[in-house]
Interface confidence: medium
């Protein structure tokens, strides 16, 4: 059956933790991605931003997991109005910002 939202969020958080904790060099060679608003629709926005990073195996699992939270199909080059399209940040910072926000949501019981 479908994975409970709390379990899916916990698994996503654990993958983000895994990525941040295991960095020995700049993540994805320091690739830059568009910053996003960490509000409603952030899962799709996060995926739209990260999907434009290619050749970075470290975030492939995160990309797959985010697709499970996003109701529509996302492809490279696709952007929604949720993006703050004037700011680019390193993938490492993007992942960490997302991690901190999701941990807050989990603590507050906001699983969807």
């Amino acid at each position: 059956g479908p994975v409970p939202p709390s379990t899916a969020l916990r698994e996503l958080i654990e993958e983000l933790v895994n990525i941040t904790q295991n960095q020995k060099a700049p993540l994805c060679n320091g690739s830059m991605v568009w910053s996003i608003n960490l509000t409603a629709g952030m899962y799709c926005a996060a995926l739209e931003s990260l999907i434009n990073v290619s050749g970075c195996s470290a975030i492939e699992k995160t990309q797959r997991m985010l697709s499970g939270f996003c109701p529509h199909k996302v492809s490279a080059g696709q952007f929604s109005s949720l993006h703050v399209r004037d700011t680019k940040i390193e993938v490492a910072q993007f992942v960490k910002d997302l991690l901190l926000h999701l941990k807050k949501l989990f603590r507050e019981g906001q699983f969807n």
Partner: antibody, heavy 122, light 108 residues
Framework: QMQLVESGGGVVQPGRSLRLSCAAS????????MHWVRQAPGKGLEWVAV????????HYADSVKGRFTITRDNSKNTLNLQMNSLRAEDTAVYYC???????????????WGQGTMVTVSS | SYVLTQPPSVSVAPGQTARITCGGN??????VHWYQQKPGQAPVLVVY???DRPSLIPERFSGSNSGNTATLTISRVEAGDEADYYC???????????FGGGTKLTVL
């Protein structure tokens, strides 16, 4: 309220053993990772060991590996540290501490016990 | 294993701002926690996850973390803030906790 109380400290000769205990109350013990942290007189904090919430994983500082064993009894809300082959450099205040836990990493220590003093001396 | 470097001491006048640093390789990618310890007492968590504060900790305590340095900032310092402060991270390479050496904050 949420509380951790250590016991079992004392004076022991080098090479001997000692068992520390930590009694937890006021929270759901079985859902938290538990740690031991020590502090030698006049020195900084040194992490000693962690045991996962369900006891499935245990990790130790290199300085105590092979000599110390961390265990827990979730039915009794207790954490233990069996210390064997004690050395003078193990002299310290030993704190137990609680840490919320993800699968791969510990969180911050949000509750600490008051500490119990262990002195290793001949 | 992972190493965290703190200055041994920081001095500040009452009412001023104290900044305590914690250096580590790519520490900005890790989650940093800070503890306050007064003489004869157990440590107390003052900042977790880089910049979050436990509910009982005053807003004067804040944290930041990027690059190779994490910083604990204490604004409008009071005499009661005099203590030792420790940063801490989880080191995945050793599956253990790492503390910085500690910084003694002196309020002049």
């Amino acid at each position: 309220q949420m509380q951790l109380v250590e016991s079992g400290g004392g004076v022991v000769q080098p090479g001997r053993s000692l068992r520390l205990s930590c009694a937890a109350s006021g929270f759901t013990f079985r859902t938290y990772g538990m740690h031991w942290v020590r502090q030698a007189p006049g020195k900084g904090l040194e992490w000693v060991a962690v045991i996962w919430y369900d006891g499935s994983n245990k990790h130790y500082a290199d300085s105590v590996k092979g000599r110390f064993t961390i265990t827990r009894d979730n039915s009794k809300n207790t954490l233990n540290l069996q210390m064997n082959s004690l050395r003078a450099e193990d002299t310290a205040v030993y704190y137990c501490a609680r840490a919320p836990q993800w699968e791969l990493t510990a969180e911050a220590f949000d509750i600490w016990g008051q500490g119990t003093m262990v002195t290793v001396s001949s | 294993s992972y190493v965290l470097t703190q200055p041994p001491s920081v001095s500040v006048a009452p009412g001023q701002t104290a900044r305590i640093t914690c250096g580590g390789n790519l520490i900005g990618s890790k989650l940093v926690h800070w503890y306050q310890q007064k003489p004869g007492q157990a440590p107390v968590l003052v900042v977790y996850d880089d910049s979050d504060r436990p509910s009982l900790i005053p807003e004067r305590f804040s944290g930041s973390n990027s690059g190779n340095t994490a910083t604990l900032t204490i604004s409008r310092v009071e005499a009661g803030d005099e203590a030792d402060y420790y940063c801490q991270v989880w080191d995945s390479s050793s599956d253990g906790v790492v503390f910085g050496g500690g910084t003694k904050l002196t309020v002049l």
